[in-house]
């Protein structure tokens, strides 16, 4: 079974501003899972609706 995501490498510790980096296996690229209260591709924006 191939997992859908992996931990990002150490090189990507600063990839996400307010979130956790996950490496999307099938898309072969990093992505960010934002902490509560943040949005954006890199979790760079405060969620004004939160």
């Amino acid at each position: 079974v191939v997992s859908h995501f992996n931990d990002c490498p150490d090189s990507h510790t600063q990839f996400c501003f307010h979130g956790t980096c996950r490496f999307l296996v099938q898309e072969d690229k990093p992505a960010c899972v934002c902490h509560s209260g943040y949005v954006g591709a890199r979790c760079e924006h405060a969620d004004l609706l939160a």
Partner: antibody, heavy 115, light 106 residues
């Protein structure tokens, strides 16, 4: 899906040069873009990388004062500028982006520094 | 992170099974690539993620991982496989490369 680099350069010592690397088939904003150096008959060295989404850069210490990496997301292109050129900068320069399943390298740009 | 290829050159015969090894100084969690380079040419990416064969690379090439040890295998060496092979870690920056293993025909 590929990385296409600019053509060979012959430049004078002391000058600067700007090399380009244009991506097709993927968005350079999705991940970091890296640059490598390979001198004749030698191994590969990492110069540095850029996060094209925000311009954040990181360099190997030995290239800190030599290289400047930039990116233009509108043209999906990363650049490597090398300054104060000497014969030590004569090399082939490669751009790259690496994933777990796939990886992409440009074909290389040969830089010759000679008077 | 240091990447050590224990053999700088290997003397091989056509048809041989060839194994090239690479050891990382720390755990790199399979963020490893293998390249083939022939004189005057750019490095050719063979494998990424330690085991994932790039499209178009012959199936006689394979990669494996065990802890900090990584292996590139060629099941039956062909003339066109005579080249220098490099490993590379991309777990962290600076990316680092092994010193290369040059295959030479006996």
């Amino acid at each position: 899906v590929q990385l296409q680099q600019s053509g060979a350069e012959l430049v004078r010592p002391g000058a600067s040069v700007k090399l380009s690397c244009t991506a097709s088939g993927f968005n350079i904003k999705d991940d970091y873009m890296h640059w490598m150096k390979q001198r004749p008959e030698q191994g590969l060295e990492w110069i540095g990388r850029i996060d094209p989404a925000n311009g954040n850069t990181k360099y190997a210490p030995k290239f800190q004062d030599k290289a400047t990496i930039t990116a233009d997301t509108s043209s999906n292109t990363a650049y490597l500028q090398l300054s104060s050129l000497t014969s030590e900068d004569t090399a082939v320069y490669y751009c790259s982006r690496m994933g777990l399943l796939r990886g992409y390298w440009g074909q290389g740009t040969t830089l010759t520094v000679s008077s | 992170i240091q990447m050590t290829q224990s053999s700088s050159s290997l003397s091989v015969s056509l048809g041989d099974r060839v194994t090239i090894t690479c050891k990382a100084s720390v755990h790199i969690n399979s963020w490893l690539a293998w390249y083939q380079q022939k004189p005057g040419n750019a490095p050719r990416l063979l494998i990424s993620g330690a085991t994932n064969l790039k499209t178009g690379v012959p199936s006689r090439f394979s990669g494996s991982a065990s802890g900090k040890d990584y292996t590139l295998s060629i099941t039956s060496l062909q003339t066109e496989d005579v080249a220098t092979y490099y490993c590379q870690q991309y777990w962290d920056t600076p990316w680092t490369f092994g010193g290369g293993t040059k295959l030479e025909i006996k």
